[in-house]
């Protein structure tokens, strides 16, 4: 190889070892029979060299730096050339560096031809290996503007006082043009301006200078977004940190054409604007930091540009002014991320403050709209607390657990509506009475309705899940000892049509000691499957549950257990089951940790099944599944 650099070219070529590899054989640059690992060639020098190995690209990199001095004479503006031409260089990973020094009063503009640039964050890399690293200068301090790949939206970067541009090309890349030009501009009076151009729908992720380190103190950086008038842009902050300010306040300012309040000033922690039509500017302004504990200001944000949706012009009123202790969250439903561009899906408060999540609280009337291509990408989760603090006031009081119609009218699917039902400890218990009798979801007889009620203890230390229940069964009521959460969970969009089937009333009743009592009135037509709470994890230690099973006069009930033994092994105490006839009070007691479970038994009158657990050893839990089937009596035994 021969590299000859013209005099006065202000170019330096440096060949040096790249990142160390685990290659056993070393490789050298050989020059005049000398083996070296670094070679520096300056303007006016001509050097002939070879490599001592077959694949020098696995060992060495080449840096070509051109210093452009705009301080002492005219600046060579225009398209920037790759010098020396890549065809004259050894095939190594190469980095072309242009270091432009200029007066503080002179603005320098880097213009990128198509494809434009896409900024990448720390730890990311470019698919084709071609990266552009751009930095500026504040006095003697170097400021990293960012690292960029091809195929993005960044078309121009304006700076002043100097710019350093490094173009990294992998050894196999055929590129032989720089892809950018330099122009002079008047002073921009800030650190830099980045112009981002959208031709159509798309997104851009951008970062403050020096990201992920701190933005320079008391500096100003602006992003100019060029967006076709027929599209809408939304800004979301992906990541930010605030420094400790001594004077002034860190903020972002938007210049939005057509806004009567330009510039619109936002704190970084505010919801950022969405649904903006056409071009806009965003500026990040730092503050004077506390010298002792400066902290860092940094920002990573995304601009999403998409077509306005039909829904974006509709305003929905959610009236929660008469509600208490309630919150409604609209959020994205979990999905697998795809690699192609996905338009944003935002919910907007008062049409401007848009974000992917929105929580509305009780006590107010809210106006919301949607900026979303497909509203099935969102769902709603609601929480409401009904609590009783004074047992004398609450006793026998009833509340209807029903989804308010305002919520059902929203164009977003309801996922969960959770009622937290709180009672004074050891004073009151709760009874749930459904509008339509409930079926317990089991593997043997799964629920196939569009919604279910999930009933679980709401006591933090207690891991007790009573089960999932849907309309169309035999459970007439569920009594529970203490605080519970009842969650209406929907499984299909058809819930809207079936909403009339929902309806659950909760009443506060005198306190009882059992964890739960299920009142079951089987229908003659079907087999009722019942299972102990906390299925798969086992009934909690020392917990007692009962089923009150009604048997009509002309029927006989067959009680069947689905395994021979309960499988529970007690560490302390005993686990037992009592089957008690309600009329005669006759009872059978089974030791669940010793006896086999009873064979199918026939009951001519209503009866109780009570199951009480011991403290089981781990892995040997108490899980029971049983069924009740009614058949007509053939002989009247009365």
């Amino acid at each position: 190889f021969e590299i000859a650099l013209p005099r006065e070219s202000n170019i330096t070529v440096l060949i040096k070892l790249g990142t160390p590899t685990l290659l056993a054989k070393p490789c050298y640059i050989v020059i005049s029979k000398r083996h070296i690992t670094m070679l520096s060639i300056k303007s006016g020098e001509r050097i002939v060299f070879t490599f001592s190995c077959q694949s020098p690209e696995n060992h060495f990199v080449i840096e070509i730096q051109k210093n452009i001095d705009c301080m002492s004479g005219p600046c060579p503006f225009g398209e920037v050339q790759l010098q020396p031409s890549t065809s004259l260089l050894p095939t190594l990973n190469r980095t072309f560096i242009w270091d432009v020094k200029a007066h503080k009063s002179i603005g320098l503009e880097l213009q990128f031809s198509i494809p434009r640039l896409r900024q990448i964050g720390p730890g990311e890399s470019c698919p084709d290996g071609v990266t552009h690293s751009i930095s500026g200068r504040i006095d003697a301090t170097v400021v990293r503007i960012g690292t960029f790949c091809s195929n993005g939206t960044v078309s121009r970067i304006k700076m002043q006082e100097g710019v350093k541009m490094a173009l990294h090309l992998p050894w196999f890349h055929p590129r032989n043009v720089s892809g950018f030009s330099i122009a002079n501009r008047s002073s921009i009076k800030r650190l830099c301006i980045i112009e981002s151009v959208f031709e159509g729908e798309g997104s851009a992720t951008l970062m403050s200078a020096n990201y992920p380190e701190g933005f320079p103190e008391d500096e100003l950086m602006t992003w100019q977004f060029v967006v076709p008038a027929h599209l809408r842009a939304s800004v979301s902050f992906l990541n930010f940190n605030l420094s400790n300010c001594e004077r002034k306040e860190e903020r972002v300012e938007y210049y939005i054409p057509g806004s009567t309040t330009n510039p619109e000033v936002f704190k970084l922690e505010d919801k950022q604007p969405g649904n903006m039509a056409g071009n806009f500017n965003l500026s990040l302004q730092g503050c004077d930091q506390d010298a002792q504990s400066p902290g860092i200001l940094r920002l990573q944000f995304q601009v999403l540009v998409q077509h306005p949706q039909n829904e974006s012009n509709k305003i929905y009123v959610v009236d929660l002014s008469n509600e208490r202790a309630m919150s409604l969250t609209i959020e994205p439903r979990p999905v697998k991320q795809s690699r192609k561009f996905v338009p944003g899906c935002f919910v907007c408060l008062e049409s401007r403050t848009c974000s992917s999540n929105l929580t509305l609280t009780s006590g107010s009337k809210h106006k919301i709209s949607f900026l979303c291509d497909d509203l099935t990408r969102l769902w709603m989760n609601v929480e409401k607390t009904i609590s009783c603090t004074d047992h004398r006031y609450c006793q026998r009081k009833s509340y209807s657990l029903q989804v308010p119609s305002d919520i059902l009218h929203l164009p977003v699917e309801l996922h969960d509506f959770s009622w937290k039902l709180l009672v004074p400890k050891d004073r009151l218990s709760l009874v749930l009475v459904p509008a339509q009798k409930l079926q317990q979801h089991t593997h043997e007889k799964p629920c196939n309705t569009s919604f279910s009620y999930l009933v679980a203890s709401a006591i933090p230390s207690q891991d007790l899940y009573f089960g999932s229940f849907c309309p169309g069964g035999s459970i007439k009521q569920i009594q529970v000892k203490q605080n519970i959460s009842v969650t209406l969970r929907t499984f299909a969009p058809s819930f809207q049509q079936e909403a009339s089937r929902q309806g659950l009333t909760v009443s506060f009743i005198p306190y009882f000691k059992e964890e739960g009592v299920f009142t079951v009135t089987p229908d003659t037509k079907s087999k009722v499957y019942l299972r102990t709470p906390n299925w798969d994890r086992g009934l909690p230690s020392l917990t007692s549950v009962s089923w009150n099973i009604s048997v009509p006069r002309d029927q006989v009930a067959c009680l069947t257990f689905f395994k021979e033994r309960s499988g529970v092994v007690c560490q302390t105490g005993r686990a037992f089951m009592i089957i008690q006839e309600q009329r005669t009070r006759a009872e059978e007691i089974f030791s669940l940790d010793e006896d086999v479970l009873p064979k199918p038994s026939f009951h001519h009158h209503s009866f109780w099944v009570n199951i009480s657990n011991c403290s089981p050893t781990s892995g040997k839990q108490l899980d029971l599944l049983f069924s009740v089937t009614l058949t007509p009596r053939t002989v009247d035994l009365t």
Epitope: P26, Y28, K33, H35, T37, M38, S52
Partner: antibody, heavy 114, light 111 residues
Framework: EVQLQESGAELARPGASVKLSCKAS????????MQWVKQRPGQGLEWIGA????????RYTQKFKGKATLTADKSSSTAYMQLSSLASEDSAVYYC???????WGQGTTLTVSS | NIVLTQSPASLAVSLGQRATISCRAS??????????MHWYQQKPGQPPKLLIY???NLESGVPARFSGSGSRTDFTLTIDPVEADDAATYYC?????????FGGGTKLEIK
């Protein structure tokens, strides 16, 4: 993997000559200097000289000019060092090594004794 | 001839501590922006083994506890932390100028 295989131990009379060999395998023999180093028992390392097999260029330390002659045979990737007019102070271990010295031979012990 | 002076001639270092060996050249061994100084380790009955080449490049397979630094006339080999297996004699060599020369060696003992 590069290996340098040196010839076996030599016993020679004073005044005689010996030719030590060093065969390189798995290496681009012509692209590296081959240097020879002497080490007497309990002593340090002493550079004798080097040869660039690509063009036969040789370098010697003053003390070994006339004592050592370095040659190389590209076809067999072998370097040779001939030591002449042997005296008892030539008794030592002689190493061949590439330069840069990533690879060393196991050493040849030369004993000069009457 | 370039004379290489190694110091100290011998050195005793406790296990886990740092060992520093110096090599001073009578004139600069730098050319083409490279320092033509190399460091070797030799144990009794074995050929020397390359540790560091061109002043600061770690030879493949050599633990990162070994490092080399310096330029022009002053060079240092550092072993940090020292292990029992590091007991050996260490040599520096320059090949910037004919004749190539070795330092006198430094014997490292582990306490």
């Amino acid at each position: 993997e590069v290996q340098l295989q040196e010839s076996g131990a030599e016993l020679a009379r004073p005044g005689a000559s010996v030719k030590l060999s060093c065969k390189a395998s798995g290496n681009t023999f012509t692209n590296y200097w081959m240097q020879w180093v002497k080490q007497r028992p309990g002593q340090g390392l002493e550079w004798i000289g080097a040869i660039y097999p690509g063009d036969g260029d040789t370098r010697y330390t003053q003390k070994f000019k006339g004592k050592a002659t370095l040659t190389a045979d590209k076809s067999s990737s072998t370097a040779y060092m001939q030591l002449s007019s042997l005296a008892s102070e030539d008794s030592a271990v002689y190493y061949c090594t590439t330069s840069p010295a990533h690879y060393w031979g196991q050493g040849t012990t030369l004993t000069v004794s009457s | 001839n370039i004379v290489l002076t190694q110091s100290p001639a011998s050195l005793a270092v406790s296990l886990g501590q740092r060992a520093t060996i110096s090599c001073r050249a009578s004139e600069s061994v730098d050319s083409y922006g490279n320092s033509f100084m190399h460091w070797y380790q030799q144990k009794p009955g074995q050929p020397p083994k390359l540790l560091i080449y061109l002043a600061s490049n770690l030879e493949s397979g050599v633990p990162a506890r070994f490092s080399g630094s310096g330029s022009r006339t002053d060079f240092t080999l550092t072993i940090d932390p020292v292990e029992a297996d590091d007991a050996a004699t260490y040599y520096c060599q320059q090949n910037n100028e004919d004749p190539w020369t070795f330092g006198g060696g430094t014997k490292l003992e582990i306490k």
